[in-house]
Every structure is written in structure tokens, then in C-alpha cells.
Interface confidence: low
């Protein structure tokens, strides 16, 4: 039955043993390899049950999404082994005695977790109205897109697990041809014959429906057609000369070959049952691409099948299906929008050849990290003239670090702060300066995503101003004229210029004004004076600039 991923539970499925790449593959296998191997653990990497009621499937976990060729043999090989047949998979509707529940009927539920996530459109923008795969002999992909929440920021930003199932259950590539439907219209199930009368059935009756699996060997690039019947039958080709079946298998079939096989057995009479084999293309010729733009990878999943190499098969026989939750898309691509960031979503995709399942991949895709939240309870204040402090509580949602910017126009400085900090002391600030601070969390994922900034302001305390600049003294007989310019750093509110004039140790003048342009009159001629000019910013006096100058000799004497 279809299985469901819950946000916290862990689904388990029996797995076949997987040989390492150095081991020889079983003779008739379908071998696939992941494009890369990740160290992710505990992340719902088990195989989805196959699309039929009896299943052996092998997980490939995970591949990198970009250029995610499901079939490039570059990593650890996994082998898919033939299975025991359980149910004839015919193109004849099963309306009679078949009491099995199709596997797809178990888990057609809605997309979770977000109410926004129903906005799902097909590539390149059309909307599909189908809600499930039809419950026909091709068992539907029936899985539920329920994300597995994992808030650990230590995990890779956007990852996917890939499960590949091909030719491992009777629902894959069952190239059966019904020439004589049974009277009830039901699908004939191959079971050991129990003799109730002396007459044997005709071979056409007995083998009215023969499910065929096409098992691919990725080393030889050839297929084996496995006839799912309960006894060892004889097969001949058009020449009717020798048995071409070994253990009900026709070996070494190249892709796209069409041939008729005549099936017979001593338990049935009359002529042979004619069975048409129609071999699909090599599996490596399909590639599932991640088409998600990096900037949208936090809320979007885009997947598209591409044919990467030509083949001779009839392309009109190829159809694609995607199932994500209870939405079905009969196109080669999907574009799912408005998803939750940092959630694991599950999409099943399959390629059908001649209306028979051919390739099935389960993608477990973790959407990229979302935009971090805003830092909470942000408070900043000055500590003195040269220092300030900002405190905050961390934002919700994952993030990697903070960026703190502080601006005293026009200068701006930004720092990267460790994610564990909740306080930061700013040093070497300018006195009596207004600082605007902004703090945002960011995360580096497919792209860097910056959260909304929280802002605050403070003004540092005053400090002594620096010295006045460019002090000039001009002298005459009994006067001096002193000019200077504003200090480089006022370090406080606008204040006054001061000039002290001393003769020896005696203060003879103490002047202050808003402009540094002092006229000092009625001085002694031919006398040396010490001139001290400084700036007072309202709280502190600056260091004085001291010049020693003399008035002129009395020119009138």
C-alpha cells in the first residue's frame, strides 16, 4: 500500500541487499548509481513502496539535484534484482475476480504543510486538474507530499534523496497482449494449473495475458525480457526453430527492438500464444533535471525530464508522470511554488513506455533555507564617548550569522557577527556622534538570504575637542590680531573659541567668542606675550595652541 511520510515519524521499508560497485552484478539486473552520495542520515531516505502490491526496490540516496542523472554510473552501484510475479498486469480492465487493492488507493491525501502550497503549476506554467493517476492496471504513484520537518541548520541547504525503481515489479514494462480475454472480462492470473477435467486449455487461453518485465543491464546496455508465467515455457521466434527463452527470459535485447515471440507449454494445446515484445530505450538516455532557480529554491521545486541522447524508439510511446501529494501532472516537468522553506517534500516521477511503467524515481527534495526572521528586542545605547553596545534576541528560523552595520553619515561600517552572540560592544567610535545601527540575520544557502533588519540609534558622549587649526598672529605697536580655524574634531555641541593673553605669568586678557577672530588692543609695545587659543565645546576644553609673539617697537617714539 502507499505509504505516508509524517513530519516526525520514520517510514521503514524492507530493502534488498545492495552490492558494492566492486561486486559483480547479478546476471539480470537493472543497475543504477547516484550522481553523488551524501552523508545525510535520519532523513527519510527509505524506498517508497513500488507501484504494485508486491515490490522489491532499491534506494539510491541521494543525488545532487542539479543535473541529477539517475543513471550515470559514477558512484556506488545498486542492483535491482528480478522479483516473483504476483499479478498479471494487463491492458484489459480488471473487472472480474481480482480482489487486490491497487497500491495507489491508499495514500491520496493533500499537500502539506502550508495552506499556500496549493498553487502548483506545470512546466512551463500550465495547471493540471488531474488529482490522481487513474486506477488502471498501471498502478498509480500514490504517495503523500507531507514534508519531514528538520530545523537543523547544519544540514545541507537544498538536498534530495532519489529512489529509483525500475523493472522490479510486475507493473513495470508489462508488455502483455491479450488476444483472448477470459469470459468474465477479468484479468487472467497465472497460477499452477489444477486439473479438473481431462481437456487442456489452449495456449492462447492459458497465456492470454503474459506480463513482461524489461530488465536493463547498464553494463551491457541490453535488456532481458522476463515473461512472468508460473512454469518454464518454450519460446520461439518467427523461424520456430529453437527455444529462445532461458528460464522464461529472452536475453540480450537491444533498445527499441520489436519482435514477436511464440509461447508454448505442454500444459496447453493448439497453437502457440503470440506475444509482441517492444523494448524501451536505454535508461541512461533520460535525465531528471532540477530547474529550480537558486533564488527561488526556498519555496519552489522544479523538475523536468530531458532526453539527453537520441534513440530509435517511437517517442510517441513515451509518457511522463509526476505525483507530488495528491496532485498528478502528465507532463515532462513540474514547477511547484509557494512551498515551505527547509522542508522535505516527496515527489514520485515515472516514465512510461507503451503505457507500461519503465522508470520510477522518488525524489525527496529539501527546499532551501528560508529568509531568517528579524532579530528581536534590539536595544542599543552609548557607553561613553568612544563606545556603544547593542543587545538583541536571536530571530526565529535558521540562520548562519548576523550582519551589524553602523552608520555615522556618510561613513558606514559593517561587521559579521557570530550566530551565538546576543550582545556586541562597538569600540573606537567618534564622540558626540549619532550612530544608526542595523542588525540582520543571514543564511548562506543556494544564495545568501538576508533577513529583515532591526534598527536602533544612539549618540556617543562628548569628549574634549582637538586643537584649533591654522592659528595666525599679526602684530602692531600696541595690538595683536589672532585668527584660527575650527578644530578637526569638535566632539560636542557647537561651543566658543577662547583666547588667553599672558605677559610673563600674568593673565592680561581672557576673551571668548563664536568666531576665532580676536583683536587684542592696548598692549605694551615691544613686549612679548603668550597667546593661548583653544575651543570649548560646551562640556570640555580642548588643548590650547600657544604662540609667543612680541608687539612692535613704538614707531612714534
Amino acid at each position: 500500500q502507499g505509504s505516508t511520510l509524517s513530519p516526525t515519524g520514520r517510514r521503514t521499508t524492507k530493502m534488498p541487499s545492495v552490492p558494492l560497485s566492486s561486486d559483480p552484478l547479478p546476471t539480470h539486473t537493472t543497475a543504477f548509481s547516484p550522481a553523488s552520495i551524501s552523508e545525510r542520515e535520519n532523513d527519510f531516505s527509505e524506498t517508497t513502496p513500488s507501484l504494485s502490491s508486491d515490490n522489491t526496490s532499491t534506494q539510491v540516496s541521494p543525488d545532487s539535484l542539479d543535473n541529477a542523472s539517475a543513471f550515470n554510473t559514477t558512484g556506488v552501484s545498486s542492483a535491482l534484482t528480478p522479483h516473483l510475479p504476483t499479478h498479471a498486469d494487463s491492458q484489459t480492465p480488471s473487472t472480474g475476480t481480482d480482489t487486490q487493492t491497487p497500491s495507489g488507493s491508499a495514500a491520496n491525501t493533500t499537500l502539506s504543510p502550508t495552506p499556500r502550497s496549493n498553487d502548483i503549476s506545470d512546466v512551463p506554467g500550465e495547471r493540471s486538474t488531474a488529482s490522481t493517476f487513474p486506477t488502471d492496471p498501471i498502478s498509480p504513484l500514490a504517495t503523500t507530499l507531507i514534508p519531514a520537518r528538520n530545523s537543523s541548520a547544519a544540514l545541507p541547504a537544498r538536498t534530495s534523496n532519489t529512489t529509483i525503481t525500475a523493472n522490479t515489479s510486475v507493473s513495470y514494462l508489462n508488455a502483455s497482449e491479450t488476444t483472448t480475454p477470459s469470459p468474465s472480462g477479468s484479468t487472467v492470473i497465472s497460477t499452477p494449473t489444477i486439473a479438473t477435467t481431462t481437456s487442456k486449455p489452449t495456449c492462447a487461453e492459458k497465456y492470454a495475458t503474459i506480463p513482461v518485465d524489461y530488465l536493463y543491464n547498464n553494463k551491457t546496455k541490453l535488456f532481458t525480457a522476463k515473461l512472468n508465467v508460473n512454469e518454464n515455457v518454450e519460446c520461439t521466434n518467427n523461424n520456430h526453430t529453437h527455444n529462445i527463452c532461458t528460464n522464461n527470459e529472452v536475453l540480450n535485447l537491444p533498445e527499441c527492438k520489436e519482435m514477436n515471440v511464440f509461447v508454448s507449454h505442454n500444459s496447453c494445446t493448439d497453437r502457440h500464444k503470440e506475444l509482441k515484445l517492444d523494448v524501451p530505450p536505454e535508461v541512461e538516455k533520460f535525465q531528471l533535471d532540477d530547474c529550480t532557480p537558486d533564488v527561488e529554491a526556498n519555496t519552489t521545486i522544479c523538475l523536468k525530464w530531458k532526453i539527453i541522447e537520441t534513440f530509435a524508439c517511437d517517442k510517441s510511446k513515451i509518457t511522463y508522470r509526476f505525483q507530488c501529494g495528491n496532485k498528478t501532472y502528465n507532463k515532462e516537468g513540474i514547477y511547484l511554488e509557494n512551498l515551505e522553506p527547509e522542508y522535505e517534500y516527496k515527489c514520485d516521477s515515472e516514465i512510461l513506455y507503451n503505457n507500461h511503467k519503465y522508470i520510477n524515481i522518488t525524489k525527496l527534495i529539501k527546499t532551501d533555507f528560508g529568509i531568517p526572521g528579524q532579530p528581536q528586542n534590539v536595544v542599543c545605547r552609548h557607553e561613553d564617548a568612544h563606545q556603544g553596545v547593542i543587545t538583541w534576541n536571536p530571530p526565529q528560523r535558521s540562520f548562519h550569522n548576523f550582519t551589524l552595520c553602523y552608520v555615522n553619515k556618510p561613513a558606514k561600517k559593517c561587521l559579521i557577527l557570530d550566530k551565538h552572540l546576543t550582545t556586541y560592544h562597538l569600540q573606537n567610535l567618534k564622540p558626540y556622534t549619532n550612530y544608526s545601527l542595523s542588525l540582520h540575520a543571514y543564511i548562506i544557502a543556494k544564495v545568501q538570504r538576508n533577513g529583515t533588519a532591526a534598527t536602533c540609534n544612539f549618540t556617543t558622549e562628548s569628549a574634549p575637542p582637538s586643537q584649533v587649526q591654522n592659528m595666525i598672529v599679526s602684530t602692531s605697536d600696541n595690538s595683536m590680531h589672532v585668527k584660527c580655524e575650527v578644530p578637526r574634531d569638535v566632539n560636542g555641541p557647537t561651543g566658543l573659541y577662547h583666547l588667553e593673553v599672558e605677559a610673563g605669568n600674568t593673565l592680561v586678557r581672557n576673551l571668548s567668542q563664536s568666531k576665532c577672530d580676536f583683536s587684542v588692543n592696548n598692549l605694551q609695545y615691544s613686549t612679548y606675550y603668550n597667546l593661548k587659543a583653544y575651543y570649548h565645546n560646551g562640556k570640555y576644553s580642548g588643548e590650547p595652541v600657544i604662540l609667543r609673539e612680541s608687539t612692535s617697537y613704538n614707531s612714534k617714539a
Partner: antibody
Framework: EVQLVESGGGLVQPGGSLRLSCAAS????????MTWVRQAPGKGLEWVSS????????YYPDSVKDRFTISRDNAKNSLYLQMNSLRAEDMAVYYC????????????WGQGTLVTVSS | GIQMTQSPSSLSASVGDRVTITCKAS??????LDWYQQKPGKAPKLLIY???NLHTGIPSRFSGSGSGTDYTLTISSLQPEDFATYYC????????FGGGTKVEIK
């Protein structure tokens, strides 16, 4: 306005190497797949390479595979083409183009840069 | 890979003429076909994408059609600025351009 400006073309001897650059502006570069297309003198257009928005998917035709390397620097809004073991048949005007859809065609093209391969 | 055969390789026409250019793919390309216009010394310009979608700013006299392996670009009434070379491009499986069709003044 979307702008793509190629540079790095010039004269190179057979067997030599050249690195082409394409500076993008006027759009969110890391949203788009990019491609290089070339045109030999008097001939038609030939696709050279394509790269996904993140740089994770890369495609080449057989004619340049194992000789050319496409790359991108999203922080610098730049696309590159490293061309090694150049042959006479590689002589062409090389255009960079933005793909309008992840595997679509180019909806914005640069003016091209000429690569001359001659001894 | 997929081959694109474009025809004719050149044609002569007059202003006001209806012009048709065809592209044939070596296999079904499922309408993943674009048309480009290129003038001498200039970069190609996208006209039609995905068989029949007119790119932004392209006059409505250009139209595209087709499916499977056969595709057509039609210029309903040729204008003086339309004399150029036209290329088709398939992008279902990698990228392949057609050989080009040069539209000249008769």
C-alpha cells in the same frame, strides 16, 4: 536594461588557450541559465555550452567536450568560457546569451567577441 | 543528437510578400522550438519561443506553428527591416540550430 558584454577574444595559435568573459547587468544574474553560442565567419549558429543558474548543471556538444569549460561567478555577475587545445575550426564570433527559461533559448545576447585561431 | 534541417537556405522576396520558412527535426521535439533573426554584424534576436509564442516587442506579422518534427515561421507581410537571416533552435535535448535561411530583396 539587460546587458551582456563579452571580452577576451583575440588571436591565438592552434593548440593554444583563451578565456572568454561575459559581464551581465540589468537583471538578476543568479536566476538565469546562461549559454555560449558561436558563429564561424559566414556560417550559421552553433551551440557551445550551457550552465545552470547555480553552476551545477553543465552541458557541452561533442565538438568542444573535454576542451572547453564553462563556469560562472554569481557574485561578480560573470560568465566564463575557458577554451583549451584550440583548433582552426573554433575560429568564430562567440556570443553569450541568457536563457529565457531553464532549458529554453536565448532572449538576451551580447555583441560577441571574435576568436581567431591561426598560426 | 537531434538534427535540424532548415529550408530554404535562401529566398528572395519583396516588401509585402508572405514568407514561410520551415524547420524539420530528426525526431519529435514536442514544440520546444524557437526562431531567431540575425542581421549582419549583429547578435541574434529571439522572435518566437516554444513554437508559437511571440517574444516581447516582436511585431505580430511574425508567427510560428508546428508540432512533432515539422515547424514553420511565417512573416505575413515582409517589411524592409525583415531582410535578414533566420534560424530555428530546438531545445528539447541539448541545443541544435538549423542551418539558417537568408531572406534577400528580390
Amino acid at each position: 536594461e539587460v546587458q551582456l558584454v563579452e571580452s577576451g577574444g583575440g588571436l591565438v595559435q592552434p593548440g593554444g588557450s583563451l578565456r572568454l568573459s561575459c559581464a551581465a547587468s540589468g537583471f538578476t544574474f543568479n536566476n538565469y541559465w546562461m549559454t555560449w553560442v558561436r558563429q564561424a565567419p559566414g556560417k550559421g549558429l552553433e551551440w557551445v555550452s550551457s550552465i545552470s543558474s547555480s553552476g551545477g548543471s553543465i552541458y557541452y556538444p561533442d565538438s568542444v567536450k573535454d576542451r572547453f569549460t564553462i563556469s560562472r561567478d554569481n557574485a561578480k555577475n560573470s560568465l566564463y568560457l575557458q577554451m583549451n587545445s584550440l583548433r582552426a575550426e573554433d575560429m568564430a564570433v562567440y556570443y553569450c546569451a541568457r536563457l529565457y527559461y531553464y532549458d529554453g533559448g536565448g532572449d538576451a545576447w551580447g555583441q560577441g567577441t571574435l576568436v581567431t585561431v591561426s598560426s | 543528437g537531434i538534427q535540424m534541417t532548415q529550408s530554404p537556405s535562401s529566398l528572395s522576396a519583396s516588401v509585402g510578400d508572405r514568407v514561410t520558412i520551415t524547420c524539420k527535426a530528426s525526431q519529435d521535439i514536442n514544440k520546444y522550438l524557437d526562431w531567431y533573426q540575425q542581421k549582419p554584424g549583429k547578435a541574434p534576436k529571439l522572435l518566437i519561443y516554444n513554437t508559437n509564442n511571440l517574444h516581447t516587442g516582436i511585431p505580430s506579422r511574425f508567427s510560428g506553428s508546428g508540432s512533432g518534427t515539422d515547424y514553420t515561421l511565417t512573416i505575413s507581410s515582409l517589411q524592409p527591416e525583415d531582410f535578414a537571416t533566420y534560424y530555428c533552435l530546438q531545445h528539447i535535448s541539448r541545443w541544435t540550430f538549423g542551418g539558417g535561411t537568408k531572406v534577400e530583396i528580390k
